[in-house]
């Protein structure tokens, strides 16, 4: 039974040349993290493998960056940068948790954090 | 250039144990790559059979995951394989190549050019 | 774990031709797939990785699309040295799966 919950940095806004974290965590299940992918809705942006570290897809290279912990860097925003993003936890023996923030890059200087919110 | 050779019996026995190792010279071992094993039975596909990483972590197909051992020496610049209890489904080339995980995930950028182990008795 | 369909098993063709190789996966490996090349006795070759990048060395007429379940791997003007099996595999999750191959031959 899948008892984990994720929990995201939600709705999030950056300004146009900007850098945003997008970041998700974890809780309330004793599930070992095997790996966790950082998508956008059809391309791949980033692999964490509990074995082999970081991979950063050759698309992204130049402007992702790995980290804090599971999380990841998006830099030199683009307004095309807007959109979802999900994190994909994959855990044993739970299976998969999926996180999304949607992330809105604005082209002005009025761009702020959204509140946190959970997907169960 | 980086290349991997790998070495072992042609021939064992059912119920017997595999052992065959890879070889990996012009390149420095120690440094931040994995190292796995494929294997192609005759005329068919090809199959993942684990890895071991740069911290030792490995990783097995579920498959073969109770016959199946991945290790590594780093003083003599190999990594071997060991699948215990064979029949012949286990007849094929054997494979070994490296991991660059940072640059290409988990596809395969460099390989030994292939062993074949036959099991018979 | 996830299966890779090749389609189709085997092709014929002729050189100069445009070739294309669909690969299918059961479930989503977003962008995490990778194409090999291999000729008799002899072992792999990787040609692409992250679905469309060309690996170092390998010829410009190969190229690679598709996200998600559905990929393809193009040739663009088949010379005598592309006739070879080629195979998908998906490096989303581990297992690692490879597809069965399609067999490229001479027409």
């Known amino acids: 039974m899948m008892t984990g919950t994720i929990e995201t940095t939600g709705n999030i806004s950056a300004e146009k040349g900007g850098s945003i974290i997008l970041q998700c965590h974890l809780s309330s299940t004793t599930a070992q993290v095997t790996q966790v992918n950082w998508e956008q809705q059809d391309q791949l942006l980033a692999i964490c493998n509990a074995d082999l570290g970081w991979h950063i897809s050759p698309s992204f290279k130049d402007r992702v960056a790995p980290g804090p912990g599971l999380g990841l860097t998006l830099q030199s925003l683009t307004v095309n940068d807007t959109g979802e993003y999900f994190c994909i936890y994959h855990t044993y023996p739970d299976g998969t948790y999926t996180g999304r923030i949607f992330l809105e890059v604005l082209e002005s200087s009025v761009a702020e954090h959204g509140a946190r919110f959970q997907i169960p | 250039d980086v290349q991997l050779q790998e070495s072992g019996p042609g021939l064992v026995k059912p119920s017997q144990t595999l052992s065959l190792t890879c070889t990996v010279s012009?390149?420095?071992?120690?440094?931040?790559?994995?190292w796995s094993w494929i294997r192609q039975p005759p005329g068919k596909g090809l199959e993942w059979i684990g890895y071991i990483s740069y911290s030792d972590s490995t990783n097995y197909n579920p498959s073969l995951k109770s016959r199946v051992t991945i290790s590594r020496d780093t003083s003599k610049n190999q990594f071997s394989l060991k699948l215990s209890s064979v029949t012949a489904a286990d007849t094929a080339v054997y494979y070994c190549?490296?991991?660059?995980?940072?640059?290409?995930?988990?596809?395969?950028?460099?390989w030994g050019q292939g062993t074949s182990v036959t099991v018979s008795s | 774990d996830i299966q890779m369909t090749q389609s189709p098993s085997s092709l014929s063709a002729s050189v100069g031709d445009r070739v294309t190789i669909t690969c299918r996966a059961s479930q989503h490996v977003s962008t995490a797939l990778a194409w090999y090349q291999q000729k008799p006795g002899k072992a792999p070759k990787l040609l692409i990785y992250?679905?469309?990048s060309l690996q170092s060395g390998v010829p410009s007429r190969f190229s690679g699309s598709g996200s998600g379940t559905d990929f393809t791997l193009t040739i663009s003007s088949l010379q005598p040295e592309d006739f070879a099996t080629y195979y998908c595999?998906?490096?989303?999750?581990?297992?690692?799966?490879f597809g069965g191959g399609t067999k490229l031959e001479i027409k």
């Open positions: 595999q998906q490096h989303y999750i581990t297992p690692w799966t």
């Open positions: 992250s679905a469309s």
């Open positions: 012009g390149h420095s071992f120690t440094s931040d790559y994995a």
């Open positions: 190549a490296r991991l660059d995980y940072g640059n290409y995930g988990g596809a395969m950028d460099y």
